[in-house]
């Protein structure tokens, strides 16, 4: 068990805050919930802060909960692969650029580590080149969401992980809107983490809707589970 | 789903106690700061009791000091206010509310994510 993974042997408070610029649209968002790694379960809900949400809730996803991959569960037999808690308490840099095909793109950098028995992940988002009547900016998507494998593999160079996935959007009138992820994760501290061989995230994602709340909001119900890479060969003679 | 529910306000005289509690589901209730806010009609929302969620230190407002006294009860998942002494200033709706931020003692209500509906207090 790396030092990391210690902090996540039972619940842990989660807290997110976004500050988020899209087209200059400018909003902030505050999450808070539980995450519990032992199921690879997180619960959330978010608040847009300053009045309505200026893009559509399922785009942001990946960049709140696809954030505290350290909440992944990981099987016993991969959990020399877990970045993501090895470089816990002191955290990690995640970065992405998002491109919604057809569309404009996203930039993200967040940083995703323990204030005290908190887990915080705070991200800086901007958005550019969207349609004002897009599927984006139109808010033309449904308020639902697919499940997803997310690509990860190590790089050494950085000290940490690329990861890389594509997510479909449903869209109203039955098409999809793709938005292809390109992530990076790098150790905010300088102590020794677990460069994993290559293997995914497997995650499935349900969006709902507090029906006492007045502010726009989202509640988020997440399970993710690590897979890709089988038992050793040891394993199967036991 | 999370649900906060209040209950046991109602219409008291100047000087009675009464004790409200806040009824969490749907949420790991030790995790979180606990706090009262309550309202008076056409006023702001005003910080009445908080409670960490660690070692249980309690923080009240001046206005109801050495009167109300703030509890939690972690294993049943709810938060109480007792209200000795009322007033008829006290006349307001008292809300809960759950955070995990560290500066919960100086959140305004809208800030807090998870909150209830409301009880209402009148004191005549």
């Known amino acids: 068990m790396s030092k990391g993974e210690e902090l996540f042997t039972g619940v842990v408070p989660i807290l997110v805050e976004l500050d988020g610029d899209v087209n200059g649209h400018k909003f902030s968002v505050s999450g808070e919930g539980e995450g519990d790694a032992t199921y690879g379960k997180l619960t959330l809900k978010f608040i847009c802060t300053t009045g309505k949400l200026p893009v559509p809730w399922p785009t942001l996803v990946t960049t709140f909960s696809y954030g505290v991959q350290c909440f992944s569960r990981y099987p016993d037999h991969m959990k020399q692969h877990d970045f993501f808690k090895s470089a816990m308490p002191e955290g990690y840099v995640q970065e992405r650029t998002i491109f919604f095909k057809d569309d404009g793109n996203y930039k993200t950098r967040a940083e995703v580590k323990f204030e005290g028995d908190t887990l915080v992940n705070r991200i800086e988002l901007k958005g550019i080149d969207f349609k004002e009547d897009g599927n984006i900016l139109g808010h033309k998507l449904e308020y639902n969401y697919n499940s997803h494998n997310v690509y990860i593999m190590a790089d050494k160079q950085k000290n940490g992980i690329k990861v890389n996935f594509k997510i479909r959007h449903n869209i109203e009138d039955g098409s999809v809107q793709l938005a292809d992820h390109y992530q990076q994760n790098t150790p905010i501290g300088d102590g020794p983490v677990l460069l994993p061989d290559n293997h995914y995230l497997s995650t499935q994602s349900a969006l709902s809707k507090d029906p006492n709340e007045k502010r726009d909001h989202m509640v988020l119900l997440e399970f993710v589970t690590a897979a890709g890479i089988t038992h050793g060969m040891d394993e199967l003679y036991k | 789903q999370v649900q906060l529910v209040e209950s046991g306000g109602g219409l008291v005289q100047a000087g009675a106690s009464m004790r409200l509690s806040c009824a969490a589901s749907?949420?790991?209730?030790?995790?979180?700061?606990w706090v009262w806010f309550r309202q008076a009609a056409g006023r702001e929302h005003e910080f009445v009791a908080g409670?960490?969620?660690?070692?249980?230190?309690?923080l009240s407002a001046d206005s109801v000091k050495d009167r109300f006294i703030i509890s939690r009860d972690d294993a049943k998942n709810t938060l109480y206010l007792q209200m000795n002494m009322l007033q008829p200033e006290d006349t307001a709706t008292y809300y809960c509310?759950?955070?995990?931020?560290?500066?919960?003692?100086?959140?305004?209500?809208?800030?807090?994510?998870?909150r209830g509906q409301g009880t209402q207090v009148t004191v005549s």
């Open positions: 509310a759950a955070t995990h931020r560290a500066d919960w003692y100086s959140s305004a209500f809208r800030e807090y994510i998870f």
């Open positions: 749907g949420i790991t209730f030790s995790l979180y700061h």
């Open positions: 409670i960490i969620r660690s070692g249980g230190e309690t």
